[in-house]
Interface confidence: medium
């Protein structure tokens, strides 16, 4: 039950995270005009990964797409790439995790297959989240660098001008959406990986084999403990399956003197 909950929660958290990564990637407000020196500006500039916009005090908004690839900074291209890779991996992860959900029955899919798929989707979510966080962080770093460069120019290069046209840009809403979304996807991925450990079916690590002793029947029960007959070396109820660390052969390699195959 706890495994199903963990897996389901991991899926939902990752789903929200990936939706957030997509939203952040599409948003125009990656960098916004810093209004520190001009809080009542008539025009407000902001930029996204795909276009630049200006909003006027009247509410009139105008946006222009980036028509060129060559003139765009390599950093911006890298951020675009990271966000797209994050979305693609996240989307594939979601697809895989849907089939991996314990609450969904697809044909006669083994629990081991579901466990593997859960692990795969979990890893994909983790990488997706990391890509988004990396992309947003690279962009934020670019903004911080440019912000201080603009500040330096503003006070050194503008001479005795009465008003400057130097525009400084600061963090836009998309950066915060991206960081949160990346974090959620990462957390969802970790939850899927944890769920995978619980999903790995114990019964698949050995065969349920019946053993017969003279006059007594001895069986391996799915609980992981060898049923005791009351005599011999097995009176301690020795645990012979410890989390799948031993092979089926190892499990069966310690027969008591009363047992025969």
């Amino acid at each position: 039950m706890a495994v199903t909950a963990c897996q389901g929660l991991g899926f939902v958290v990752s789903l929200i995270g990936i939706a957030g990564i997509i939203a952040a990637t599409c948003m125009d407000q990656w960098s916004t005009q810093d209004l520190y020196n001009n809080p009542v500006t008539a025009v407000f500039n902001y930029q996204g990964l795909w276009r630049s916009c200006v909003r006027e005090s009247s509410g009139f908004t105008e946006c222009r797409g980036y028509f060129t690839l060559l003139g765009l900074p390599a950093m911006l291209q890298a951020v675009r790439a990271l966000m797209i890779v994050g979305i693609v991996l996240g989307a594939i992860g979601l697809l895989v995790s849907i089939f991996a959900l314990k609450c969904i029955r697809i044909g006669s899919m083994e629990d081991s297959a579901k466990a593997n798929m859960t692990l795969t989707s979990g890893i994909m979510f983790i990488v997706s989240g990391l890509c988004a966080i990396a992309g947003v962080s690279v962009f934020a770093n670019m903004l911080v660098t440019n912000f201080w460069m603009s500040t330096a120019n503003m006070y050194t290069g503008m001479g005795g001008m009465v008003q400057t046209v130097q525009t400084r840009y600061t963090f836009g809403a998309a950066l915060f959406v991206g960081w949160v979304a990346g974090g959620l996807t990462l957390i969802g991925g970790v939850m899927m990986c944890i769920a995978c450990r619980g999903l790995a079916p114990e019964e698949t690590n050995y065969k349920a084999v019946s053993y017969h002793a003279s006059g007594h029947s001895v069986a391996y029960k799915p609980g992981g403990f060898k049923a005791s007959t009351g005599f011999g070396s097995n009176t301690k109820n020795k645990k012979i399956y410890d989390g799948g660390a031993r092979t089926e052969d190892e499990v069966q390699s310690y027969p008591s003197k009363h047992d025969y195959v």
């Epitope: 008539a42 025009v43 500039n45 630049s52 105008e62 222009r64 003139g71 765009l72 008003q163």
Partner: antibody
């Protein structure tokens, strides 16, 4: 090189219509907004209309609103100004101008400038 | 109705400095109006000098400079030459996709 050439001007009677054209060359026409500006004889420049690079937005001066229509054909690299219900006060040299705000650098800035002008075409409204 | 005001005429001696201004009948001009300046000689199409307050257009000599002085946009010509004798127009972006030209200033280089 970057060039704009207006055509379609002439003498027309009041109340009649006329369509001006502006042929663009030497640049990616579809990436730029375009203006029409006019100048009455012996007077100053007057902004008439603007159209966005993709034709999504059109704005007009109050003096021509409802009578003039700006349009463009990006496949033909041509800007148009359809002038209806012409009046004597519409007599002027009509210039088309390119709106400059497309930069190759990031981030783009909106400069709201008219950087390239055509030589103009004369429209005379007279009975 | 917004009116953009300019001095109708101005005179300057060769080599002298002149500042042409561009104001609003109501309110003051700021960089948010993206003031730009155009030079027009009789019978010719206008030529862009300055845009976005203080950015010189390509090929424009550095004798021409733009700024905001007080509550007006300003075009300053230092070391005026005979061929600077022209009409000078400023245009302000009023927002919402509307531009308004000033009445123009006729500059005479005496």
């Amino acid at each position: 090189q970057v060039q704009l050439v207006e055509s379609g001007g002439g003498v027309v009677q009041p109340g009649r219509s006329l369509r001006l054209s502006c042929a663009a060359s030497g640049f990616t026409f579809s990436s730029y907004g375009m203006h029409w500006v006019r100048q009455a004889p012996g007077k100053g420049l007057e902004w008439v209309a603007v159209i966005w690079y993709d034709g999504s937005n059109k704005k007009y001066a109050d003096s021509v609103k409802g009578r003039f229509t700006i349009s463009r054909d990006n496949s033909k690299n041509t800007l148009y100004l359809q002038m209806n219900s012409l009046r004597a006060e519409d007599t002027a040299v009509y210039y088309c101008a390119r709106r400059y705000d497309v930069l190759t650098a990031y981030p783009y800035y909106f400069y709201y400038n008219m950087d390239v002008w055509g030589p103009g075409t004369t429209v005379t409204v007279s009975s | 109705q917004t009116v953009v005001t300019q001095e109708p005429s101005f005179s300057v001696s060769p080599g002298g400095t002149v500042t042409l201004t561009c104001g609003l009948n109501s309110g003051s001009v700021s960089t948010s109006y993206y003031p730009s300046w155009y030079q027009q000689t009789p019978g010719q199409a206008p030529r862009t000098l300055i845009y976005s307050t203080n950015t010189r257009s390509s090929g424009v000599p550095d004798r021409f400079s733009g700024s905001i002085l007080g509550n007006k946009a300003a075009l300053t010509i230092t070391g005026a030459q005979a061929d600077d004798e022209s009409d000078y127009y400023c245009v302000l972006y009023m927002g919402s996709g509307i531009w308004v030209f000033g009445g123009g200033t006729k500059l005479t280089v005496l």
